[in-house]
């Protein structure tokens, strides 16, 4: 018995930031769990991790170097990734590991959700405004 | 059939570390289904579980101890690790590993102990 | 922390005899009607072993002298007839929540 996971396909970081949700077929109400994002096709990189509890506040840590928050809902948790690169655009994939009570209960790999990391292009105002028109 | 069989205890000096290894078989500590867990036993007291990992590789903690513990495992040996830092003498125990299936987590297989005693 | 109870911490019984050994949980181990509380026997110098799982089922290759009940906070293991093997130690513990716990234990000696 697996949990299924829905991302956005894509999403696009214009000011690098983005919020990434993770919705799940399973309701995490009153459950013990460890939801995380992973970079990359392999999922090699653990991007952030939230960490639930019946009797704690939510845990929401990144041992990867990630500016990032997190917000439980009933059945999603959303990721919150701030300053973001250019070079981090990528494919990430949400994942959830239910612990307490048993079962134990994980999901099936998701489509992922590709997260495009648009730079900031500030123009500089000119120094000499050009002549205004009549 | 399922197998445990835990090795490296001994005496050691308070303030040390410990590494106590679990070699199972009969089953893949890789595979769905089934976790491990180590527990321990101060002479003559009761049972304190010290922590689980399961088959993704998702270590689990008992909150008083997790600030000395990390679990790990090698697939290849089909192993599982127990590293123990700063002991003290109230860390002399038998120290088990015990399988747990996922359904209910009652730990149906446990290996036969390892003594570990801390003193100086 | 989930603590649980036993009692009674010991208890000299005679073979044959019918043994019931209580277990409370601070709260309740019930979910979705299952209950997350598991019973084992252990003898000096051996591994606990175990012998009832989700408060009533039987564990397989233990006699069915062994049997369990209870739900929510309190739970029961019986032996309905003492046998020379029986006398050890037996403990309960919960799986409900995060950290799993355990009883002190209930010694069993021969009287």
């Known amino acids: 018995n697996k949990i299924l996971v829905k991302q956005s396909p894509m999403l696009v970081a214009y000011d690098n930031a983005v919020n990434l949700s993770c919705k799940y077929s399973y309701n995490l109400f009153s459950r013990e769990f460890r939801a995380s994002l992973h970079k990359g096709l392999d999922s090699a990189v653990e991007v952030c991790v939230v960490y639930g509890n019946y009797s704690q506040q939510l845990q929401v840590y990144s041992k990867t170097g990630f500016n990032c928050d997190g917000k439980l809902g009933n059945e999603s948790v959303t990721f919150y990734l701030q300053n973001l690169y250019v070079n981090q655009t990528d494919i990430y994939f949400c994942k959830i590991e239910v612990m307490y009570p048993p079962p134990y209960l994980d999901n099936e790999k998701s489509n992922g959700t590709i997260i495009h990391v648009k730079g900031k292009h500030l123009c500089p105002s000119p120094l000499f405004p050009g002549p205004s028109k009549p | 059939e399922v197998q445990l069989v835990e090795s490296g205890g001994g005496l050691v000096q308070p303030g040390g570390s410990l590494r106590l290894s679990c070699a199972a078989s009969g089953f893949s500590l890789s595979t769905g289904g089934v976790g491990v867990s180590w527990i321990r036993q101060a002479p003559g007291k009761g049972l304190e579980w010290i922590g689980s990992?399961?088959?993704?590789?998702?270590?689990y903690y008992n909150p008083s101890l997790k600030s000395r513990v990390t679990i790990s495992r090698d697939n290849s040996k089909n192993t599982l690790y127990l590293q123990l830092n700063s002991l003290r003498a109230e860390d002399t125990a038998v120290y088990y590993c015990a399988r747990y299936e996922y359904d209910y987590y009652a730990f149906d297989y446990w290996g036969q102990g390892t003594l570990v005693t801390v003193s100086s | 922390d989930i603590q649980l109870t036993q009692s009674p911490s010991s208890l000299s019984a005679s073979v044959g005899d019918r043994v019931t050994i209580t277990c409370r949980a601070s709260?309740?181990?019930?979910?979705?009607?299952?209950?997350?509380l598991h019973w084992y026997q252990q003898k000096p110098g051996k591994a606990p072993k175990l012998l009832i799982y989700a408060a009533s089922s039987l564990e397989s290759g233990v006699p069915s002298r062994f049997s369990g009940s209870g739900s929510g906070t309190d739970f029961t293991l019986t032996i309905s007839s003492l046998q020379p093997e029986d006398f050890a130690t037996y403990y309960c513990q919960q799986s409900y929540r995060s950290p799993p716990t355990f009883g002190q234990g209930t010694k069993v000696e021969i009287k």
């Open positions: 990992i399961y088959h993704s590789g998702s270590t």
């Open positions: 709260q309740s181990v019930d979910f979705y009607g299952k209950s997350f």
